[in-house]
Interface confidence: low
């Protein structure tokens, strides 16, 4: 049968169906119909936006689409004790007071349940002491602070710059260091871009703005009372001292306006070096505490927020496939928000709408996929990615015997330069041929593809002409599909131009200014941005979903792999004596990289060859290449982080956002000189290597001929 | 036994167009991505572009040098591949391959002539 | 574009010879490299997929090897049939690129 027969197809009803009926008008009544009120998860409104995307789905065409309920555990801030932060004199009387409340933007003064700042998950506590301010509380920060200039955090208040990495990582390493509580404030060096106005007037964030956010370290667990399994009805929950990821010290964030109050007062040493210089006008002293006059003055906490068992909901919707309805394509994104939501989630939750709508456009008039398509709004991303997590749990076994691929979407937008993407190797060759066939939205490109414009703006590192694609990380709901369960992932939005805008993320990210209007007047007046992320998206799923061979190039696993070991190599080699004295070889690495580059070469000929009209062979090659990445999960997981399982990639130790190759080797060779038992150090480098030799051998051999 | 067989192949002159076929056989031809490579005489290999297949969406890829002036495209019921060649010039003259995915096989030529 | 550079440009070599010809690619192309042999007036053939997978029916005396931007095609006991232009050429990126060829001459 051709394709077309195979899935009840016209010549119509292809790609460029799918992509004509996404409309930017679409998406931009979609974005302000999800942005009206706050959609924090746990909340009434929250549940009553799940109800109407399920309704709308519905409207849509989708076979099915249903709620799934957890109760996991949230925090959220005592609406009659306010969390703040103070400075005291001797006397033990407050003289300064952060504030409240973000001043709310305009046109929203009357809109009630905006949480005001707060750090989720945070314990409750009235800690009071000297202030140590340790840049943006990096491993590395904490290196330069103990071990070079000699100061000591423990029993300290310590404040840190957002940026750079997760705030749960910045959370983590405090308490290491023995601080007794953590302020998080958002530096305009890191969150004000030069040359442009503070919201209202402008995309930047003004001295009253804060940015929200959990600090849990839960390492893919999900909810933190029910490690590893749904949190449903009949759910064994731990008890709160052994739950999961949860800080042990108080933590608030705060505006730069009141950071200002706190740092200008900091004596004790100068800053290292100028990158520990923002761009406040404070000396930037590292303390610990306050100069002369203000010697006797401390800073104290109040944090009285609480932890509660609270119901959410997913909605998942079905477009059962054609052909083969047992193997699933994933597009997922959150609902949740802190408060408003303009960008995140808000700006993805309108393209899956979009995207949703033309796919049941193309059903009512009588196509399907060849493979099955879950659609997923997800609740409590902001709290943990624990809406996505929980029905993984639930649906585990299904999923690594079904799943495809998922596609991630969060945010659509995080600035209007050009477009990101992260993704498995796998999916390389799709989203170069995929953006090779989508036009480009950017001013200079009329009539130039996406992956003109993408390429020559974001240029590869490795390979000229091509554009840059980066490992997965985490910090999104792909961690549990990827990460877990081995599911092939991708994710992709527009960015912005990173050599010009050094700030973390966008500086309205969490805050209560991340309204409809900042996107409709600063990022994406048109919703050209946010239409060709849709394509992106939609288009993945769309080939993911239809064409009769899975668009997955093994090969391009051999190239990273090569790529990485070599990297993980050259670390190493760091210590030639030590790798001598105890033996510490990569040769078992290099050979499997070796076997898995010359049998994917072979699988990918086969390929091309086999008989496509045989359904048990095509089933029987595509199975191979969707078990592939099943194939890198190691069911014991990387050490002390049993649900991150897959040994070619990992969020960083230090840095949960970002992505870690060969992240086992890598952590065992992590600041190895330091460690007390060299001997027991590099003998677990020797073991991570035998692990991840192991593994890619094992998933080369996946893709040899069955028999 | 997988055959390519180019045919069209001529003389012509600059500006003007030609329209190379190829007839395959021996293979399921729907399944596979078809491309052309051209030798001019005495020098080396140069491709051409390439046709995907129709789960691919007939997705087409051109060398810089012939982009805007030939065409490929395929009829799969007749199992033939087509490189509508335009706007032709002198150093287009080669023989002109087509050949399956990988270039694992090849026809045995056509000659095209550009000359005044 | 990748540029596949081919040396020698053309070797002299007697039956029963070995004969190594070396393929430089401009960027990393992986193993996205093939080798082709090629006698006057016919067309090409190939010999080598994925860098180092000999084709269906190519006798074994010929290895291909390498990856990243090195690739070297290796002919053992070289026979009177293996008198030839020798390509290679990369299908990891647009536009695909060949060698501009290894002429193998009896000596």
């Known amino acids: 049968k051709s394709s077309n027969e195979a899935t009840n197809i016209t010549p119509k009803h292809n790609m460029k169906a799918f992509l004509d009926e996404l409309k930017a008008e679409n998406i931009k009544k979609f974005l302000y119909n999800f942005t009206q009120i706050p959609h924090l998860a746990g909340t009434e409104q929250n549940f009553q936006l799940a109800k109407q995307i399920q309704s709308q789905w519905k409207e849509f065409g989708l076979d099915s689409v249903e709620l799934a309920h957890y109760d996991v555990l949230l925090s959220y801030p005592n609406k009659t004790h306010p969390n703040y932060i103070s400075i005291i004199n001797e006397d033990g009387n407050e003289i300064f007071n952060t504030s409240l409340f973000e001043p709310p933007p305009p046109g929203y003064e009357n809109v009630s349940d905006i949480v005001p700042p707060f750090s989720a998950f945070s314990p409750q506590g009235m800690p009071e002491g000297d202030l140590v301010y340790v840049n943006y509380a990096r491993t590395e920060d904490f290196f330069k602070l103990e071990r070079d200039m000699k100061i000591n955090c423990s029993g300290k208040i310590v404040i840190a710059r957002y940026g750079k990495v997760f705030r749960g990582n910045k959370v983590k390493n405090a308490q290491l260091a023995g601080a007794k509580g953590v302020i998080l404030y958002s530096d305009p060096a890191d969150y004000f871009a030069p040359g442009v106005k503070s919201y209202p007037d402008g995309w930047n964030l003004p001295g009253g703005g804060v940015q929200r956010g959990n600090i849990l370290n839960l390492n893919g667990a999900g909810d933190p009372l029910t490690p590893g399994y749904p949190a449903n009805e009949y759910a064994y929950r731990r008890g709160i001292a052994e739950a999961v990821g949860l800080p042990s010290i108080p933590v608030h964030p705060i505006g730069y306006y009141d950071a200002q109050k706190l740092l200008e007062k900091m004596g004790g040493s100068a800053p290292p070096d100028s990158s520990w210089r923002g761009s406040l006008k404070v000396p930037y002293n590292v303390g610990p505490g306050f100069t002369g006059n203000f010697s006797t003055q401390k800073v104290k906490m109040h944090i009285h927020s609480t932890n509660e068992v609270t119901r959410i909901y997913n909605v998942i919707g079905t477009l059962r496939g054609a052909v083969e309805p047992d193997r699933y394509v994933i597009l997922g994104g959150h609902r949740d928000s802190w408060v408003f939501g303009g960008i995140d989630p808000q700006s993805g939750a309108a393209v899956v709408h979009e995207i949703v709508r033309s796919f049941g456009t193309l059903k009512k008039e009588g196509w399907r996929p060849r493979r099955t398509i879950l659609f997923a709004s997800w609740d409590a991303e902001e709290f943990g990615l624990l809406g996505s997590t929980e029905w993984a749990e639930e649906n585990s076994r299904l999923l690594q015997e079904r799943g495809v691929a998922y596609i991630n979407a969060d945010s659509s937008i995080e600035g209007n330069y050009t477009l990101r993407v992260d993704c498995t190797p796998l999916m390389y060759s799709l989203v170069h041929n995929l953006t090779k066939e989508l036009k480009s939205p950017d001013e200079g490109f009329e009539g130039k593809s996406l992956y003109e414009s993408w390429t020559k703006k974001s240029p590869s590192p490795e390979f000229s002409g091509m554009p840059r694609i980066s490992k997965l990380g985490s910090g999104n709901d792909f961690e549990v599909f990827f990460q877990r369960l081995g599911i092939a992932s991708g994710r992709a939005r527009y960015t912005k131009n990173w050599e010009t805008n050094k700030f973390s993320g966008y500086p309205l990210y969490h805050s209560v200014y991340e309204t409809y209007e900042l996107v409709e007047k600063f990022y994406d007046p048109m919703f050209k941005y946010h239409l060709t992320v849709a394509q992106v998206r939609g288009g993945m799923v769309f080939e993911l979903a239809n064409s009769i061979v899975l668009p997955f190039d093994c090969r391009d696993y051999a190239v990273v792999l090569r790529k990485y070991a070599d990297k993980i190599y050259s670390i190493s080699m760091k210590h030639p004596q030590e790798m001598k004295t105890y033996s510490v070889s990569f040769d078992s690495l290099f050979s499997a990289v070796k076997n898995f580059t010359e049998i994917a070469s072979k699988f990918s000929e086969r390929l091309q060859d086999f008989d496509k009209s045989n359904p048990i062979v095509l089933r029987m090659m595509n199975d191979q290449l969707m078990f592939l990445e099943r194939a890198f999960i190691d069911p014991l997981g990387l050490p002390d982080r049993p649900f991150y399982r897959h040994v070619i990639y990992a969020p960083s130790s230090h840095n949960k956002y970002a992505g870690e190759s060969f992240p086992g080797i890598y952590d065992a060779l992590f600041d190895i000189e330091s460690k007390v038992d060299p001997s027991k150090a590099w003998g677990e480098v020797k073991r991570q290597i035998y692990v991840a030799a192991f593994t890619v051998q094992a998933a080369a051999e996946t893709l040899s001929e069955v028999a | 036994e997988v055959k390519l067989v180019e045919s069209g192949g001529g003389l012509v002159q600059p500006g003007g167009s030609l329209k190379l076929s190829c007839a395959a056989s021996?293979?399921?031809?729907?399944?596979?991505?078809m491309n052309w490579v051209r030798q001019a005489s005495g020098k080396g290999l140069e491709w051409v572009g390439e046709?995907?297949?129709?789960?691919?969406?007939?997705?087409?890829h051109y060398a810089e040098s012939v982009k805007g002036r030939f065409t490929i495209s395929r009829d799969d019921s007749k199992n033939t591949v087509y490189l509508q060649m335009n706007s032709l010039r002198t150093e287009d003259t080669a023989v002109y391959y087509c050949?399956?995915?990988?270039?694992?096989?090849w026809g045995q030529g056509t000659t095209v002539t550009v000359s005044s | 574009n990748i540029v596949m550079t081919q040396s020698p440009s053309s070797v002299s070599a007697s039956v029963g010879d070995r004969v190594t010809i070396t393929c430089k690619a401009s960027?990393?192309?992986?193993?996205?490299v093939s080798w082709y042999q090629q006698k006057p007036g016919t067309a090409p053939k190939l010999l080598i997929y994925g860098a180092s997978n000999r084709f269906t029916g190519v006798p074994d005396r010929f290895t291909g090897s390498g990856s990243a931007t090195d690739f070297i095609l290796t002919i053992n006991n070289l026979q009177p049939e293996d008198f030839a232009t020798y390509y290679c050429g990369q299908s990891y990126t647009f536009p695909y690129t060949f060698g501009q060829g290894t002429k193998v001459e009896i000596k």
């Open positions: 046709i995907r297949s129709q789960s691919n969406n007939f997705a087409t």
């Open positions: 960027e990393n192309v992986g193993t996205y």
């Open positions: 050949t399956r995915r990988w270039n694992n096989f």
């Open positions: 021996g293979f399921t031809f729907s399944n596979y991505w």
